[in-house]
């Protein structure tokens, strides 16, 4: 003989436990439907009756099956760093995430807590890595033959152009200048002394680590003062 | 701008040879290294040296080269590659070329980016008895 | 010492196929690498340095990618003109480590 369907509220069997979406009430000692997500339990049940749900109220929220007598508070509105990318409604919380040029300093269980803005490398320095939703950017010096002239969180050192006839020697954070003789290298259009990379790798791929030997040379012009420690700049 | 190299010959194993590069269109004092690279008959690429050709002309070498081999600066348009104690296996097209300078600050040590953007024909060293 | 180790030593393509030329350093070199072509009886060429810049004149065929120790040249859409002696070179010249050439890599054009 099939096994008869038990209706809620039941009491279920001894050793045994109560099936799925219900929940063993002690009070009732009975097996009791639990709500859906984005309701609570109104009234919980009894030997005779089943749990009462309601809908969650405005900025409250369930997001699993339950029987919480009342909603979760949906957390505080996100702050001017950050980005909505869930909304609060019946049964989710906001999810507040990092603006673009910002990482998460301090996670939480879901979003982030705390932002903080993306470390811009000074020029003569370029990113080393990346920064991610979760860490920020590295800088590095620029290598000998590269430089970087922009205050950034994405630019990479770029190698120097090549030029036919050099009227400024290249630094760390200046590209090579060339004389009025066009330079071997290809130029971008409206794009004067910038190297073009053929692949179409943005700026935001792997960038070339740092020499081992700390690099360089004494060229033409006078040496410069060293630059800081650090190459970043503040926001 | 172009590069010409001169001074190759047949010579008995031994002996010395002077190379002469000669630039055109540009001076070998601004910004640039001039480099020299050769090519065995049938064979791949094998760098020599390079000497920057300002004021103090430093200069660079393979490891293999250092000794024999000898660059120097002559005039602000030539650059020269001594050679001594040939022997049949520097048998070899020999090619100046020049490589672009760059400065940078705050770094200590010797490095070099080295990209040959101008060469010359060659010259070929024969050495033979 | 540095090595590059060019692969493969010699490949045909026909024209309009692909070729791909491979350059393994025997240590890092931090992208510092540049490729020639030469041409029998001529000079070589600088094609593209710094890993993946292109030189100008030099067509948009041709790419350079890679990085660390592994790089590679690409020809796409080979042309008879392509027919030629490829060479890569560590442009990275320090106190412990030296410029150096792979052995060459000669392309043939059906």
């Known amino acids: 003989l099939p096994a008869q369907v038990a209706f809620t509220p039941y009491a279920p069997e001894p050793g045994s436990t109560c099936r799925l979406r219900e929940y063993y009430d002690q009070t009732a000692q009975m097996c009791c439907s639990k709500c859906s997500p984005g309701q609570h339990a109104k009234v919980f049940c009894t030997k005779t009756s089943d749990t009462v749900c309601d809908s969650c109220e405005d900025s409250t929220y369930t997001q699993l099956w339950n029987w919480v007598p009342e909603c979760l508070s949906c957390g505080s509105r996100c702050s001017s760093d950050q980005v909505e990318t869930q909304a609060c409604t019946r049964e989710q919380n906001r999810i507040c995430t990092c603006r673009p040029g910002w990482y998460c300093a301090l996670s939480k269980q879901e979003g982030c807590r705390l932002c903080a803005p993306l470390r811009k490398c000074r020029p003569g320095f370029g990113v080393a890595r990346p920064g991610t939703e979760t860490s920020d950017v590295v800088c590095k010096p620029c290598a000998p033959g590269t430089f970087s002239n922009t205050t950034s969180s994405t630019d990479i050192c770029r190698p120097h152009q090549i030029c036919n006839v050099v009227a400024i020697p290249g630094n760390a954070s200046m590209d090579a200048v060339c004389t009025s003789t066009s330079p071997t290298r290809s130029m971008a259009p409206g794009a004067v002394h910038l190297p073009q990379p053929v692949s179409t790798r943005s700026q935001h791929t792997q960038p070339t680590p740092e020499p081992s030997t700390a690099p360089s040379t004494s060229f033409l012009l006078p040496m410069g003062p060293s630059p800081p420690a650090e190459g970043s700049t503040g926001d | 701008q172009s590069l010409e190299e001169s001074g190759g010959d047949l010579v008995v194993p031994g002996t010395s040879l002077t190379l002469t590069c000669t630039a055109s269109g540009f001076d070998l004092s601004s910004f640039y290294y001039m480099c020299w690279v050769r090519q065995a008959p049938g064979k791949g690429l094998e760098w020599i040296a390079c000497i920057y050709a300002v004021s103090s002309g430093s200069t660079y070498y393979a490891s293999w080269a250092k000794g024999r081999f000898t660059v120097s600066r002559t005039s602000s348009t030539t650059a020269t590659l001594q050679m001594t104690s040939l022997t049949a296996a520097d048998t070899a097209t020999y090619f100046c070329?020049?490589?672009?300078?760059?400065?940078?600050?705050?770094?200590?040590?010797?490095?070099?980016?080295?990209?040959?953007?101008?060469w010359g024909p060659g010259t070929l060293v024969t050495v033979s008895s | 010492a540095l090595v590059m180790t060019q692969t493969p030593a010699s490949v045909s393509a026909a024209v309009g196929g692909t070729v791909t030329i491979n350059c393994q350093a025997s240590e890092d070199i931090d992208s510092y690498l540049a490729w020639y072509q030469q041409k029998p009886g001529q000079p070589p060429k600088l094609l593209i340095y710094?890993?993946?810049y292109l030189t100008s004149g030099v067509p948009s065929r041709f790419k350079g990618s890679g990085s660390g120790t592994e790089y590679t040249l690409t020809i796409s859409g080979v042309q008879c003109d392509d027919a030629a002696t490829y060479y890569c070179?560590?442009?990275?010249?320090?106190?412990?480590?030296?410029?150096?050439f792979g052995g060459g890599t000669e392309v043939v054009v059906k």
């Open positions: 710094y890993a993946s």
């Open positions: 070179q560590s442009a990275f010249y320090s106190n412990n480590t030296e410029t150096a």
């Open positions: 070329a020049r490589h672009q300078s760059y400065e940078t600050y705050g770094y200590v040590g010797v490095v070099y980016a080295t990209y040959f953007s101008l």
